[in-house]
Amino acid sequence: IVLRPPRVHNSEENTMRALTLKDILNGTFSYKTFFPNWISGQEYLHQSADNNIVLYNIETGQSYTILSNRTMKSVNASNYGLSPDRQFVYLESDYSKLWRYSYTATYYIYDLSNGEFVRGNELPRPIQYLCWSPVGSKLAYVYQNNIYLKQRPGDPPFQITFNGRENKIFNGIPDWVYEEEMLATKYALWWSPNGKFLAYAEFNDTDIPVIAYSYYGDEQYPRTINIPYPKAGAKNPFVRIFIIDTTYPAYVGPQEVPVPAMIASSDYYFSWLTWVTDERVCLQWLKRVQNVSVLSICDFREDWQTWDCPKTQEHIEESRTGWAGGFFVSTPVFSYDAISYYKIFSDKDGYKHIHYIKDTVENAIQITSGKWEAINIFRVTQDSLFYSSNEFEDYPGRRNIYRISIGSYPPSKKCVTCHLRKERCQYYTASFSDYAKYYALVCYGPGIPISTLHDGRTDQEIKILEENKELENALKNIQLPKEEIKKLEVDEITLWYKMILPPQFDRSKKYPLLIQVYGGPCSQSVRSVFAVNWISYLASKEGMVIALVDGRGTAFQGDKLLYAVYRKLGVYEVEDQITAVRKFIEMGFIDEKRIAIWGWSYGGYVSSLALASGTGLFKCGIAVAPVSSWEYYASVYTERFMGLPTKDDNLEHYKNSTVMARAEYFRNVDYLLIHGTADDNVHFQNSAQIAKALVNAQVDFQAMWYSDQNHGLSGLSTNHLYTHMTHFLKQCFSLSD
């Protein structure tokens, strides 16, 4: 199945050129998406090309600038946020990145009624997180790990917490491990729907071991970065959830929400908080051994001014074959009765599907079913439920948006996107306005991405928001590689793969093969999306065949495949890459003497193990920022899939699954090991240990470090990295420079 349709029929092949590495590094062929910043059922904000903030009304067709680029520029603002009462806008500047999601910034409040910045009781700087209440213009913000509340932007702040301390106590923001592995946000505070209450998490990292690494900078002495970072088996953060009445914050102060008894009996995590009404909140908790999750619905007790979480409102989700959920435990989407909800979890056949839960999980009504998976619930209204799945035509790497009419019986299902632009668009996400009056569809491919606006009642397309015309024109004279998505059936396992083929691909010829691997639990690499990236260049210009394979442990194809790697990371993911390579060789167009593998992060781990598999399949390979031992990685992530590194649990496999244990097997391959020295996520320690083991085994290898770079190897390092890797591969494949 050729997924990238030809865009132009040009008989003059000589006017077409191949992609260059410069094209990729300059981002020449990057695309744009359009996500409306919804502010009501029919209005949204969007930052125009000239940086004005424009309000669009879909129903009147009118638009006007609510904030000029001049005002934005006056404080060097790179972001904004309109208060729900539309009286104020916060302007964000001095953005300073911390970890994956977190950053600090300076905030200015602009008063739209008088066209001036609010003076007096200005916000401190730098702020770690700031947000408006959902109604009106109250402000909550986190400064120096403490939470503050303002009733109005010009008012003095009310300090909610006092115990915040750098690297010790975090209020309203997550610590490193919660940010990266549990919440996937920069915040840990949540307003109730009408802004009456504010819930927040407190993380106590006092007893967590610290990772320390040098940051070289430009000074005479490097500084040391210290991060409380629990590695597998180490002491974890202790979390508590509090709720404060924002109308009378000093009255009873923050009230702690009780933890379910079955959770509190041993180490546990808080996984998410969902407000249902102003006086009902839903908390999700997870045992440290992450196969038991408890969803707890708590009610405000007016008489006691406390939060009550009755046992009858605790719902347990347990996995007997793996961990709870997919990558994360799914979150509930509540119904209009404010007690029942929709949630995605495994059905009896081991596929993740939408269920409706009212009184108990045992009595759940299954809403979707089949040998495919429901992936995300976007919105539930009085009569419709919108969700995405990979059901259509049995391609796990697609995403289509569906609507189920839940206001009538039997509920009927309609695919909203399946036939809209079938060749161009097979991978969608959506963004809904209030009450799903309107929605935007964002198509990521396989053709050029396009964003469109739709009527939430009829699904009619209203207008195109972004169609990437400039990109389409720019690609007209580019010889893009061909892409196909197919599957291999091997020993009752389906291995989906994406193959990227040189433009003039000829099946009768032999090509070098590069495997690009990630392969982490609950990941998916074989997706029907558009991309012009480094591997596109390698196929287009350097004539390589590139393949991506989703093996055991990957997502959206059922629990059998997903949980196959449970407690056994580093085994089946590697086996399946090797199996696929053997199948590719059988296809007849692969030069079996020129096969390489590369990966980043988890992919670096898999590529290292594949190179050290002793199969003789791979001539060379690259590992960028690899994990080398699961004892070095974060507790929350690692233990989810591996259990604990203790004798009575899974220590044996922790030890057996290291890259270092296979040092001897690197002797007959060319290995390029790359890592950033300031990697807060997969610590440089991982590559340092690989290098040490290889040296001790007297195995030759190549290595590159990037000073002061984190897990993303961004900026100039990116250019250097891809140039370096290109040279390495061309040398390995004996391709002339």
Partner: antibody
Framework: EVQLLESGGGLVQPGGSLKLSCAAS????????MSWVRQAPGKGLEWIGE????????NYTPSLKDKFIISRDNAKNTLYLQMSKVRSEDTALYYC???????????????WGQGTTVTVSS | ELVMTQSPASLSASVGETVTITCRAS??????LAWYQQKQGKSPQLLVY???TLADGVPSRFSGSGSGTQYSLKINSLQPEDFGSYYC?????????FGGGTKLEIK
Amino acid sequence: EVQLLESGGGLVQPGGSLKLSCAASGFDFSRYWMSWVRQAPGKGLEWIGEINPDSSTINYTPSLKDKFIISRDNAKNTLYLQMSKVRSEDTALYYCAGGYYRYPYYYTMDYWGQGTTVTVSS
Amino acid sequence: ELVMTQSPASLSASVGETVTITCRASGNIHNYLAWYQQKQGKSPQLLVYNAKTLADGVPSRFSGSGSGTQYSLKINSLQPEDFGSYYCQHFWSTPYTFGGGTKLEIK
């Protein structure tokens, strides 16, 4: 016009069996959840159980679970209640009831039959 | 199983009066409650569902209220046709038990 008509009641000896039927007309029977409810002489209403449109979900009141079986035949627009091991306390007027789907996912008993009497006596 | 306790068991009132019947659940039923009227020798008839929504064709003098475990049915300005028995029933979790009933008689 919606109609539910129960039949099959009568005199049955203790320990015996009986099958009640409920014929539906005037609505799309195959889309409705259906229930059986009974009322002992001079007493209140007691919910027996329910069945969903495609018979994949059947719920009973725990005390009657082992002696009563609810089933349906959508082709015949008929609901059934198979009673076994009956005792004198099963003497009652037996109603079938059905109703509208109420968002989210539950059903009220909007329509009731006139009932059929079951008398358990030796 | 949830127990529904209805009160009073019986009640005498005159035409034109206002009466209130209450129903207490042994656990939170989250407004999943229906009220029925049953006249002598007849089948029950649905009056209210979702604790407060009137069924089609039910006069507006009937109203339901409540939340959590406490619910009530109020009849304003009693009419002659309102006399009979009233039952509450929860729909929170199976079994969907009924209250014991309230017999409303003419004074």
